[in-house]
Amino acid sequence: GDLLIQKTIKKQVVLEEGTIAFKNWVKTGTEVYRQFWIFDVQNPQEVMMNSSNIQVKQRGPYTYRVRFLAKENVTQDAEDNTVSFLQPNGAIFEPSLSVGTEADNFTVLNLAVAAASHIYQNQFVQMILNSLINKSKSSMFQVRTLRELLWGYRDPFLSLVPYPVTTTVGLFYPYNNTADGVYKVFNGKDNISKVAIIDTYKGKRNLSYWESHCDMINGTDAASFPPFVEKSQVLQFFSSDICRSIYAVFESDVNLKGIPVYRFVLPSKAFASPVENPDNYCFCTEKIISKNCTSYGVLDISKCKEGRPVYISLPHFLYASPDVSEPIDGLNPNEEEHRTYLDIEPITGFTLQFAKRLQVNLLVKPSEKIQVLKNLKRNYIVPILWLNETGTIGDEKANMFRSQVTGKIN
């Protein structure tokens, strides 16, 4: 009975050639889509001249098919029972699932101006930057197409920088023809309770972005977890998109295409300030923007983004402190639309449905030496876009799952 099923499950979730888990792990059988909503700035001049609140209007979804490429360089290591791989990146625009085309225009923060003025705070260098910004006719805001904003464009200001820097800028540049990793994960052969748990990422057990425990690479990549998941568990996973490990807790039982799954969600506590959640002290990396680590709901990942002042949050600043969203008008956070969840089949530990939601923001600060930032009276964490990456097990796969896994148990 149960022992036989357990034995079968343990055998089938091992990450090695011939198992059900391995086949779906190498190349996901689920169609994964990434939807983008861009925050179109409605009052660029007023912000630049008067330091007004930024009025944004979200436009989307613009949908791309992602994660359709098989893992590469899959290599088993029999000695330490691990398997290493690269996860290739690819995105294909899906016009039928989008409100417009990749050529649609948006008024957004000038990424290069905001980043350069933050990175180079030396007064003399800022004077150089100011002359280059003026010469290139750049401003605090810019109009860019969706394709440019996401995948890259040649920036006119950066093209004038007096030494060879990358002049191409884009929120996800470079993306196509790149890969995430190398990941090295436990294959579960010697210990099934470690299956899919990351041993190293890019050859290291920590990230070098954070202090203390915040820097650890914990858990899996969230595509699956070790089998026999309990509702009481805290599921740890690492997300390279947000340059950190995070966790999910059980919320409710869900029936997904006839398969009983556990819905795990990212709790608001994971985004809390160290005042409320002392464990988060090491995610507070500076004192000014974070108001002495009392602000919450935004994560400064600049160390992971070559010094560029990128802040990650939940969409519409869900679970963020009022001071973060106060200078931005037009945001409407709600849990149903904007939180992240994972629907996990508890016996196998497979994630059969998920919605990963996050928002990309950029910090822009006043600068007395840079004309286009001179009139700002405050710092802004400016929302650029939010994304919803979703995947759901297909009907055929669900039937197979019901007959081979849950059906046998029930």
């Epitope: 003399f124 920088v161 007096p162 030494y163 060879p164």
Partner: antibody, heavy 115, light 108 residues
């Protein structure tokens, strides 16, 4: 105000080794590519080596004349850049400056290679 | 290696005179990556003009720079005594980074 202070120069015999250090202040050191440039009456200003940022995996470039003998490194936590020089030759003699090039230069430290 | 040749090696001018010094590159480079430094006797070099024509902070407006491709120049419209120094051109277009041999400006 930005400041760069080189140290470690002195007299060394041909074939010997020396390590130069440079401490920076007044700017966010970790955001700048750092260079060593030397100057001698015979050769004028001569670029020696460059080290980029952590985000560039601390990529380095060297002048052909020092490749394999000199190593540039940096410690962002100490706002410092170093130049380890091995198998020194008489033609390595000169004033060594550390600089992010577009900012100011240090006052330099003098290296003399002579027997 | 992109060799930068400066001429003249030494020049002499009276206060109020206009002077021009040149820097020739052995191969074409982007004007964005051609810079000039001023070095006074006993001092370290200072960035003077960046990206061919942009004056660094604190540089008097009598200085100007121009050029493209392989030919670049630094001009002082009306020389003053404090301009006595050696001026070096430098390229950041490719490795190795190279400096010119310098033009020494003497004031009569």
């Amino acid at each position: 105000e930005e400041k760069l202070e080189e140290s470690g120069g002195g007299l060394v015999q041909p074939g010997g080794s020396m390590k130069l250090s440079c401490v920076a202040s007044g700017f966010t050191f970790s955001n700048y590519w750092m260079n060593w440039v030397r100057q001698s009456p015979e050769k004028g200003l001569e670029w020696v080596a460059e080290i980029r940022l952590k985000s560039n995996n601390y990529a380095t470039h060297y002048a052909e004349s020092v490749k394999g003998r000199f190593t540039i490194s940096r410690d962002d936590s100490k706002s410092s850049v170093y130049l380890q020089m091995n198998n020194l030759r008489a033609e390595d003699t000169g004033i060594y400056y550390c600089t992010p090039l577009l900012l100011r230069w240090g006052q330099g430290t003098t290296l003399t290679v002579s027997s | 290696e992109n060799v930068l040749t400066q001429s003249p090696a030494i020049m002499s001018a009276s206060p109020g005179e206009k002077v021009t010094m040149t820097c020739r590159a052995s191969s074409s480079l982007s004007s964005t990556y051609l810079h000039w430094y001023q070095q006074k006797s006993g001092a370290s070099p200072k960035l003077w003009i960046y990206s061919t024509s942009n004056l660094a902070s604190g540089v008097p407006a009598r200085f100007s720079g121009s050029g493209s491709g392989t030919s670049y120049s630094l001009t002082i419209s009306s020389v003053e005594a404090e301009d006595a120094a050696t001026y070096y051109c430098q390229q950041y277009s490719g490795y190795p980074l190279t400096f010119g041999s310098g033009t020494k400006l003497e004031i009569k």
